[in-house]
């Protein structure tokens, strides 16, 4: 006997028996409990009786022998039609055909569900030559069947450009139920119904589903797969799984946790990132979201001054990026700041309150009632003013800045004077005669220079003119400063 594969040539029976193989555990579910039925040999059904005419493709050779006798039609012999076996078992099946010796280079190929099986499959073809014909047996073995091996297998042989096709051999791999859809973790609203889905397939069918909630069986009577469980509502977290049962045993799905949405925990670690005179940049660490995404946050700000009226300013912002710049604050003031965030269920409690202070700022208003007059005897300009209201100084006054601009015949010259915070008058020497002097004053704190007052102009005449009335800032409502000579 000639053997194509490197294997001892042995005639092989047409009906396969159990084929031992290593038990693989590919695609093993989380928990599989096979029924204690022990070893089951493969079941085989032959759709045709031995000796019946073949229904596959038949090639009628055109060649005749020396005695001119026509050759019989070529066809694969009948074999088992349907093999049922358990997952991970071994199986071997074959096709056989007798081919007249006049044909050379006959090869048999295996096909599954219309696709040729190439490569790493255990296919062996054995040849048994006789005087006139060669018996060819092509066997196909799978050492540890999986569900993916389910299907219809056929042999094909090409002779004289004719294709001979065997009857199909149906392989049905049976095993524990296999989940195609398992329940998924969810976050749900308290006391609100929701659905869970579980689907498993055989073979063998049918597959029946039982639901388990916190280790208690929900349905004592099975439901056919697929099954949708309507959970009537939960008041606390629960774990669900489903059991899929078929004749081979049961498979249990993964357990999934169903959480109850709740209000978030308060934010923690509220901290000051930066302070200016009128703003504070804060950040916080969000608390637990209560199984529902944060929607927005609220920053609550109250003056820490015991004499304040205790009113709370509220600033709303998006939940991200856990950062907010609180604006429109007073300078050099103390504040208590708390943060609260909300999800679809409601608002968290307020975080622990933190104390924060704004820094000194430049004054927000200019000195008031600026008056300028010329003291000709000393050749000076006297300037007087009132300091801005304490509330609007935005810090401790360290002095004033006086801008005086001298304009005469196309020449302009600006000079700046710094004066201390004590008092509210200053004297500057006349820089140019026959010129206009424009005076503006700004209050100064460590936080910076405040706005300048409206300009007050005074004309400084040439030497020898009469005395002059003072100039001052206009009364409220006047558009332009008035020059009084």
């Amino acid at each position: 006997a000639i053997t194509e594969a490197r294997e001892e040539a042995k005639p092989y029976p047409l009906f396969p028996g159990p084929f031992p193989g290593s038990l693989q555990t590919d695609h093993t579910p989380l928990l599989s409990l096979p029924h204690a039925s022990g070893y089951q040999p493969a079941l085989m059904f032959s759709p045709t009786q031995p000796g019946r005419p073949h229904t596959g493709n038949v090639a009628i050779p055109q060649v005749t022998s020396v005695e001119s006798k026509p050759l019989p039609p070529l066809a694969f012999k009948h074999t088992v039609g349907h093999i049922i076996l358990s997952e991970h078992k071994g199986v071997k099946f074959n096709c056989s055909i007798s081919v007249p010796n006049i044909y050379q280079d006959t090869t048999i190929s295996w096909w599954k569900d219309g696709k040729e099986l190439l490569g790493a499959h255990h296919a062996i073809t054995q040849f048994y030559p006789d005087d006139e014909v060669t018996a060819i047996i092509a066997s196909f073995s799978i050492t540890s069947v999986q569900r993916s091996d389910n299907g219809s297998y056929i042999c094909k042989m090409k002779i004289n450009n004719e294709e001979i096709v065997s009857d199909p051999i149906y392989i049905e791999v049976q095993g524990l139920p296999h989940f195609t859809k398992q329940p998924e973790s969810m976050n749900v609203t308290r006391n609100t119904a929701f659905n869970l889905t579980c689907q498993a397939v055989g073979p063998p069918e049918p597959v029946n589903i039982f639901w388990v909630q916190n280790s208690s069986r929900v349905n004592e009577q099975p439901e056919k797969s697929p099954s949708v469980l309507t959970v009537p509502g939960l008041t606390e977290m629960a774990v669900f799984s489903c059991e899929a049962h078929n004749d081979k045993g049961l498979t249990v799905s993964k357990g999934v946790q169903i959480n109850i949405k709740a209000i978030p925990s308060p934010p923690t670690e509220v901290s000051i990132r930066n302070s200016t005179a009128h703003s504070i940049l804060i950040s916080w660490v969000p608390g637990f979201d209560g199984y529902s995404p944060f929607r927005n946050c609220s920053i609550q700000v109250k003056e820490a001054d015991p004499l304040s009226n205790g009113s709370v300013m509220i600033f709303n912002t998006s939940a991200l990026p856990h950062l907010y710049q609180i604006k429109q604050l007073q300078a050099l003031a103390n504040y208590s700041i708390g943060v609260s965030c909300m999800n679809e269920i409601g608002w968290s409690a307020v975080s622990p309150w933190i104390l924060a202070s704004t820094t000194e700022g430049a004054p927000s208003v200019a000195p008031l009632n600026v008056t300028v007059f010329l003291n000709e005897s000393s050749d000076n300009v006297d300037i007087r003013w009132m300091k801005p209201p304490t509330k609007q100084q935005d810090g401790e006054l360290v002095g004033y800045r006086i801008s005086h601009v001298w304009q005469s015949a196309g020449i302009s010259k600006e000079l700046l004077e710094e004066v201390g915070q004590n008092g509210s008058r200053a004297r500057i020497s006349v820089q140019v005669h026959n010129a206009t002097c424009t005076v503006r004053i700004a209050a100064v704190t460590r936080g910076g220079v405040g706005p300048f007052s409206d300009p007050v102009k005074i004309f400084i005449p040439a030497h020898g003119w009469v005395d002059y009335a003072p100039s001052s800032t206009p009364a409220p409502g006047n558009a332009d400063p008035v020059l009084i000579i």
Epitope: Q213, S216, V218, N219, E220, Q221, P232, A238
Partner: antibody, heavy 118, light 106 residues
Framework: QVQLVQSGSELKKPGASVKVSCKAS????????LSWVRQAPGQGLEWMGW????????TYTDDFKGRFVFSLDTNVSTAYLQISSLKAEDTAVYYC???????????WGQGTLVTVSS | DIQLTQSPSFPSASVGDRVTITCRAS?????MHWYQQKPGKAPKLLIY???NLAQGVPSRFSGSGSGTEFTLTISSLQPEDFATYYC?????????FGQGTKLEIK
């Protein structure tokens, strides 16, 4: 609509047997379990157990193991409760109830009074 | 087995009253169901899974609770509500009933 109709009252002597029937209509019989509940005169409700109408497998609570048998005839959508060796303390109203998810008894038969007296 | 204790056992109330019946379990249960029974009649499902109203039950009935303590509330008592009420637990086999609460007219 869903209905569970039970057989009529029974008067039995101690030691005898009784078989109570519960005929279901208005739904597919084999999709819901059937429970049996006992209520002794002036007393509360006691769950006796149930029968799986799909597989025919009965489950009994500890107090009702032995003399009590649940059975089915799915052809006529009927469940049965048989009590053997009747005792005076078996005197009660016996209810059948449809048994759904989460152990809810959503529909009840009208009850069958079994009186055991010599 | 889980024991269910209902209280009060024999409350009396008037039409229009708000009535609350409590059911305490000897250990934590998943859900509580409530049934109403009138003399000579079969029990009728009132509330299932703690807080869900059964079909055709008036909205004056409500249920709440979790763990070991559950309540049935009738917001405004009607003449037809005078009956016996039973709680029944799900979560641990065997399922058990409370001893019943007989609501009587004051």
């Amino acid at each position: 609509q869903v209905q569970l109709v039970q057989s009529g009252s029974e008067l039995k002597k101690p030691g005898a047997s009784v078989k109570v029937s519960c005929k279901a209509s208005g739904y597919i019989f084999t999709t819901y379990g059937l429970s049996w509940v006992r209520q002794a005169p002036g007393q509360g409700l006691e769950w006796m157990g149930w029968i799986n109408t799909y597989s025919g497998v009965p489950t009994y609570t500890d107090d009702f193991k032995g003399r009590f048998v649940f059975s089915l005839d799915t052809n006529v959508s009927t469940a049965y409760l048989q009590i053997s060796s009747l005792k005076a303390e078996d005197t009660a109203v016996y209810y059948c109830a449809r048994y759904t998810n989460y152990g809810v008894f959503d529909y009840w038969g009208q009850g069958t009074l079994v009186t055991v007296s010599s | 087995d889980i024991q269910l204790t209902q209280s009060p056992s024999f409350p009396s109330a008037s039409v229009g009253d708000r009535v609350t019946i409590t059911c305490r379990a000897s250990s934590s249960v998943g859900y509580m169901h409530w049934y109403q029974q009138k003399p000579g009649k079969a029990p009728k499902l009132l509330i299932y899974a703690t807080s869900n109203l059964a079909q055709g039950v008036p909205s004056r009935f409500s249920g709440s609770g979790s763990g070991t303590e559950f309540t049935l509330t009738i917001s405004s008592l009607q003449p037809e509500d005078f009956a016996t009420y039973y709680c029944q637990q799900w979560g641990s086999l065997p399922f058990t009933f409370g001893q019943g609460t007989k609501l009587e007219i004051k």
